[in-house]
């Protein structure tokens, strides 16, 4: 297993609809044709897997069925979107990238993107 640098933004604010997008960029040492991307959430010293996807270079990402994530790839960049977020989902979202094929296997883990989610205030009742 060889190390690889992964960069991602430090902070992202989710939209009022609970959607957050960020770019995960990796410094590919070789010419990988198959890549696996995993998004991990770290909160209160607990790490959980949010979603995982694989792709062949030049293609869209293929996520697990019923995933809350979508994404596209362009060169060594992966554009990730997480949907259905609520205030309780605020936390550090870490991008993990694995170059699966051809060998050698490379692994890179980003420093994480702090995603802030603010639940929208309900609209006040109107007398009109």
């Amino acid at each position: 297993c060889k190390a690889m640098h992964v960069a991602q933004p430090a902070v992202v604010l989710a939209s009022s609809r609970g959607i957050a997008s960020f770019v995960c960029e990796y410094a590919s040492p070789g010419k990988a044709t198959e890549v696996r991307v995993t998004v991990l959430r770290q909160a209160d010293s607990q790490v959980t897997e949010v979603c995982a996807a694989t792709y062949m270079m030049g293609n869209e990402l293929t996520f697990l069925d019923d995933s809350i994530c979508t994404g596209t790839s362009s060169g060594n960049q992966v554009n990730l979107t997480i949907q259905g977020l609520r205030a309780m989902d605020t936390g550090l979202y870490i991008c993990k990238v694995e170059l699966m094929y051809p060998p050698p296997y490379y692994l890179g883990i980003g420093n994480g993107t702090q995603i802030y989610v603010i639940d929208p205030e309900p609209c006040p009742d109107s007398d009109f």
Partner: nanobody
């Protein structure tokens, strides 16, 4: 577990055409990518073409304009139509299945282009 069954390899003269087929079966997710790699003697396995469930395709530069990859999602089958073949296309062609949870190789089919 995913099984891949390939067919369609063989010997053809330069300038000719061949059609490779690969059928996937087993525990398949709703979305996955299928593709073709090839490996010439003494060389590494290189990606030739790939296609996603939605029909997004990608080709190696060396085959663009000559090879076409297509897919029948109802039958979980991928087709590689190879035209204007040249001796450099001689290799073992391997079908590839890739999803978020599973990866599989076909057994390989020999393609030989004679001059």
């Amino acid at each position: 577990q995913v099984q891949l069954v390939e067919s369609g390899g063989g010997l053809v003269q330069a300038g000719g055409s061949l059609r490779l087929s690969c059928a996937a079966s087993g525990r398949l997710s709703r979305t996955f990518t299928m593709g073709w790699y090839r490996q010439a003697p003494g060389k590494q396995r290189d990606l030739v073409a790939s296609i996603t469930t939605s029909g997004s395709t990608n080709y190696a530069d060396s085959v663009k304009g000559r090879f076409t990859i297509s897919r029948d999602n109802a039958k979980n089958t991928v087709i590689l139509q190879m035209n204007s073949l040249v001796p450099e296309d001689t290799a073992v062609y391997y079908c590839r299945f890739l999803s978020a949870s599973t990866a599989a190789w076909g057994q390989g089919t020999q393609v030989t282009i004679s001059t």
